[in-house]
């Protein structure tokens, strides 16, 4: 007897069994079910994706596909051999022993096998196409990588060459630096020695200066007393002369013209023969009102009336409008002569203004204006300056055209802020301007980054606070 049975074994694989008499033939076919579903990107019939995969993934996929291809090829070969070796004998027996319907069964099996084989072949063709596609992509990527690598190698070579050049330069410069260090250390040693010598000299000079200062104070006081005595003496002489002369006297007595005893500025004092620097009494123009001032009879030919002086921070310059109007401080030290006096004095004759500056490093500079005057109080003592020369900057550190004077209680500047309150001191503030010689006094080593200090921008910049300043005036025709 013969029969044909189609079933599924315990592992889920399909099998075809032919029973022919005592013989039983079982055909195990390859599993199409084990292929990935169509949702997978690796599905044999799926469209190849454009997005490039990572190189390592691609290699792994190729290996998997190659293994599948090889397995399928081996299986087909085995199947072919099996059919050739075994089926010949069996087919002879079947032909001899079985009836027509058994032949039909065999034909069905053969057809089924052929269909399966054709399907497998189609799938293999798809896989081969994908492998070729991916291989081409990988070759292209490798080519691009190769080009990039060549470029990078060239760049590295260039950079290596540059590095070598720089190293050579560096060695040369290092040698130079070492040479310079040697020279500098020698120079430093000699400078240290000089410094020690200078320190000894300075200490000696300091004591001498102290003595001289004491003598100067005494001399100044004596000078004032002498002035008064001279004044009194002149008055006595004049009264004696008056008494001696009478209208009936036949002998004519020469009456000595009275010497000038009131001075409007230090230039007049100098011209009268008093040529020693010190404190003198000045008289307001067209008035009997008097004011004490320091006269510098030494600088640039003398005759200078000092209107401002800073040297040690002993006087507070953050004062009211009234105080700046009338003056404050001590003419022997730090002081402000007074805006009203200066305004009246400079309003009558042409005056020059000299500003002397000292920094904390022992440097000195000056600015000279060939015409200076202050307007009256009704114009807020506005400053007028022309003709700048000197060493404290080619540009004027007092704003041009002149600004009004401002104090902590009278804000006349051009700033949204209140310059006098913020920067300290009364000055001709603009917004707020390049200078303020009446700012806060800062001692050495505390004098940088000070925005409210004693400032002269075009000599030392904005944050540097000066050690000493003097403002002095003299008639232009002196």
């Amino acid at each position: 007897y013969s029969n044909f049975r189609k079933s599924v074994d315990s592992t889920g694989r399909r099998q075809y069994q032919v029973q022919n008499g005592p013989c039983s033939y079982t055909f195990l076919l390859p599993e199409t079910d084990s292929c990935r579903s169509s949702s997978s990107p690796y599905m044999s019939n799926a469209v190849q994706r454009d997005a490039p995969l990572d190189y390592d993934d691609s290699v792994q996929r190729l290996q998997v596909l190659e293994n599948i291809l090889e397995n399928n090829t081996q299986w087909l070969m085995k199947l072919e051999n099996y059919i050739q070796d075994n089926m010949k004998k069996e087919m002879v027996e079947i032909q001899q022993n079985v009836v027509q319907n058994q032949t039909a069964v065999m034909i069905e099996i053969g057809t089924s096998l052929l269909n399966q084989t054709a399907a497998q072949t189609r799938k293999l063709t798809d896989v081969e196409a994908q492998v070729l596609n991916q291989t081409t992509r990988l070759e292209l990527q490798l080519l691009q990588h190769s080009i990039s690598t060549n470029k990078l190698e060239k760049q590295i070579l260039d950079q290596t060459s540059e590095i070598n050049k720089l190293q050579n330069k560096n060695s040369f410069l290092e040698q130079k630096v070492l040479d310079m260090e040697g020279k500098h250390s020698e120079q430093l040693q000699s400078m240290k020695e000089q410094k020690d010598e200078l320190q000894v000299l300075v200490s000696k000079q300091s004591s001498v200066i102290d003595e001289l200062e004491k003598k100067l104070v005494t001399a100044t006081v004596n000078n004032s007393l002498l002035q008064k005595q001279q004044h009194d003496l002149m008055e006595t002489v004049n009264s004696l002369l008056t008494m001696m002369s009478s209208p009936n006297s036949k002998s004519s007595v020469a009456i000595r013209k009275e010497e000038q005893t009131t001075f409007r500025d230090c230039a007049e004092i100098f011209k009268s023969g008093l040529t020693t620097s010190g404190i003198y009494t000045l008289t307001f123009p067209n008035s009997t009102e008097e004011i004490k001032a320091y006269c510098d009879m030494d600088v640039g030919g003398g005759g200078w009336t000092v209107i401002q002086h800073r040297e040690d921070g002993s006087v507070d310059f953050q004062r009211t409008w009234k105080e700046y109007k009338e003056g404050f401080g001590s003419p022997l030290g730090e002081y402000w002569l007074g805006n009203e006096f200066v305004s009246q004095l400079t309003g009558q004759h042409r005056y020059v203004l000299k500003i002397q500056l000292k920094d904390w490093e022992g440097n000195e500079a000056h600015s000279l204006y060939d015409h200076f005057y202050l307007a009256g109080e009704e114009s807020n003592y506005r400053i007028h300056l022309t003709g700048l020369t000197g060493t404290a900057g080619k540009i004027s550190s007092i704003s041009q055209p002149g600004s009004d004077f401002s104090t902590k209680d009278s804000d006349n500047d051009k700033c949204i802020c209140k310059c006098s309150q913020m920067l300290s001191g009364g000055w001709w503030f603009d917004a707020c301007g390049p200078s303020n010689l009446n700012g806060q006094y800062y001692p050495q080593k505390q004098n940088t980054n000070k925005f409210n200090g004693i400032k002269w921008y075009y000599w030392k910049g904005s944050g540097y606070s000066l050690k000493a300043t003097t403002m002095m005036i003299r008639p232009a025709d002196f």
Epitope: S399, C415, A431, C432, G433, P434, Y457, Y458, G461, S462
Partner: nanobody
Framework: EVQLVESGGGLVQPGGSLRLSCAAS????????MSWVRQAPGKGLEWVST????????GYADSVKGRFTISRDNSKNTLYLQMNSLRPEDTAVYYC????????WGQGTTVTVSS
């Protein structure tokens, strides 16, 4: 007309942070070093920090070093001060200032550090 307008001040608790801004106009902002300066109640001006014209170099007062950061954006003509770990002694009116001959100043912005 030159203008410096400070903003960003306010009341903050000790340990808190604030960022001050200073908008400049009327002069070539990118050509000048800029500074932050403060004035505590009843006291004089105190320098806080300076940044050079390009923004590459900065300096700070010892009292704010490590807590404050100055910066600038020349494309926006703006100066900044980032203030962290604020203390009661940082209470003051903060001004920005241009290192210009005029020494331009704004109206200031008040920072109060209090619990």
């Amino acid at each position: 007309e030159v203008q410096l307008v400070e903003s960003g001040g306010g009341l903050v608790q000790p340990g808190g942070s604030l960022r001050l801004s200073c908008a400049a106009s009327g002069f070539t902002f990118s050509s000048y070093a800029m500074s932050w300066v403060r004035q505590a109640p009843g006291k004089g001006l105190e320098w806080v920090s300076t940044i050079n014209s390009g923004g590459g170099r900065t300096g700070y007062a010892d009292s704010v070093k490590g807590r404050f950061t100055i910066s600038r954006d020349n494309s926006k003509n703006t100066l900044y001060l980032q203030m962290n770990s604020l203390r009661p002694e940082d209470t003051a009116v903060y001004y920005c200032n241009a290192d210009h001959p005029q020494g331009y100043w704004g109206q200031g912005t008040t920072v109060t550090v209090s619990s």
